[in-house]
């Protein structure tokens, strides 16, 4: 399955919007910094096929979309930027979904892929628990925004590598 060219543009737009969403200086939140243990090994693109990678990317974008669709998120960010960001993620989900659907009839979720999906889910669990512990404070959201920028960058790079493989 080939992701449309507009998909990579959407990735870049999502990253730009997330950067624009920053409201407070990252330096004023240094005390709140946290290592969420991003599962980099699931995004290095070497250990599984393209179809499996796309399932993991879908999980990553879906969890990001859900995270920024909560009431707490709506209260934290400027509404129009948040809506544009969510729209970009939604479009990416549609692209990825179409690719996964092509493969679903062919094979059940491979065992290796299952652990990758769980690793992504656990990563977002750590983010969710951090936000709850910090009572969704502005600094907590800023730390999470910076973290999601990092994880989306990994996703973008993996997608670039997948396109080069084609």
């Amino acid at each position: 399955c080939d992701l449309p060219q507009t998909h990579s543009l959407g990735n870049r737009r999502a990253l730009i919007l997330l950067a624009q969403m920053g409201r407070i200086s990252h330096f004023s939140c240094l005390k709140d910094r946290h290592d969420f243990g991003f599962p980099e090994e699931e995004f290095d693109g070497h250990q599984f096929q393209k179809t499996q990678a796309i399932s993991v990317l879908h999980e990553m974008i879906q969890q990001t979309f859900n995270l920024f669709s909560t009431e707490d998120s709506s209260a934290a960010w400027e509404q129009s930027l948040l809506e544009k960001f969510s729209t970009e993620l939604y479009q990416q989900l549609n692209d990825l979904e179409a690719c996964v659907i092509q493969e679903v009839g062919v094979e059940e979720t491979p065992l290796m892929n299952v652990d990758s999906i769980l690793a992504v889910r656990k990563y977002f669990q750590r983010i969710t628990l951090y936000l709850t512990e910090k009572k969704y404070s502005p600094c907590a959201w800023e730390v999470v925004r910076a973290e999601i920028m990092r994880s989306l960058s990994f996703s973008t790079n993996l997608q670039k590598r997948l396109r080069r493989k084609d």
């Epitope: 859900n66 659907i101 979720t109 769980l118």
Partner: antibody, heavy 119, light 108 residues
């Protein structure tokens, strides 16, 4: 509010199949994995598997791979579980439960469907 | 798969009594992925405690959860009649996800 609606009961004959439904409302159906859980009378809970309604990918507990088949119908926002070659061991209450994270993990359950396998 | 063993299987407590239910895992479970559910007869399970020690919405403050590794517990500081129910621990640290066999808590 989030709701998962399941029929109350199904009576089926040994060797037959049954397709259980779980109709979702109050949230975007395609955003969350749907899980299925078995509970035999007076017993514990067993995780059967999960399906992502967005694209239909499934993850099964090995113990249920040859017994259960998970599907979804996005147009009717409903998840399904087909149980095949039924025996008395399959008589149980089957719940659907919505995935999520933190305080939302299995925070929403259907009322359960009681499946009775009897001649 | 990770087997969760709950003890005791059945216990009864008097109103006001302190109650501790335990959940022992066959192999280590990260505390972030250890949950507890309450179930009353004829009803579906209700999320009660998430990530070992966080109370779900609407759960009374007399409940608490603790533990790490292979040993977890749910404690009620002062038993009340409405707490009579079955309690199940659950892990989603690794596939397949598993539940304990449950502890049925009765009121004396």
């Amino acid at each position: 509010q989030v709701q998962l609606q399941q029929p109350g009961a199904e009576l089926v004959k040994p060797g037959a199949s049954v397709k259980l439904s779980c109709k979702a409302s109050g949230y975007t159906f395609t955003n969350y994995w749907m899980h299925w859980v078995k509970q035999r009378p007076g017993q514990g809970l067993e995780w059967i598997g999960e399906i992502n309604p967005s694209h239909g990918r499934t993850i099964y507990n090995e113990n249920f791979k040859s017994k259960a088949t998970l599907t979804v119908d996005k147009s009717s926002i409903t998840a399904f579980m087909q149980l095949s070659s039924l025996t008395s061991e399959d008589s149980a209450v089957y719940f659907c439960a919505r995935g999520g994270l933190g305080p939302a993990w299995f925070a929403y359950w259907g009322q359960g469907t009681l499946v009775t396998v009897s001649a | 798969q990770i087997v969760l063993t709950q003890s005791p299987a059945i216990m009864s407590a008097s109103p006001g009594e302190k109650v501790t239910l335990t959940c022992s895992a066959g192999s280590s479970v990260d505390s972030s992925y250890l949950y507890w559910y309450q179930q009353k007869p004829g009803s579906s399970p209700k999320l009660w405690i998430y990530s070992t020690s966080n109370l779900a919405s609407g759960v009374p403050a007399r409940f608490s959860g603790s533990g790490s590794g292979t040993s977890y517990s749910l404690t009620i500081s002062s038993m009340e009649a409405e707490d009579a129910a079955s309690y199940f621990c659950h892990q989603w640290s690794s596939y397949p996800f598993t539940f304990g066999s449950g502890t049925k808590l009765e009121i004396k």
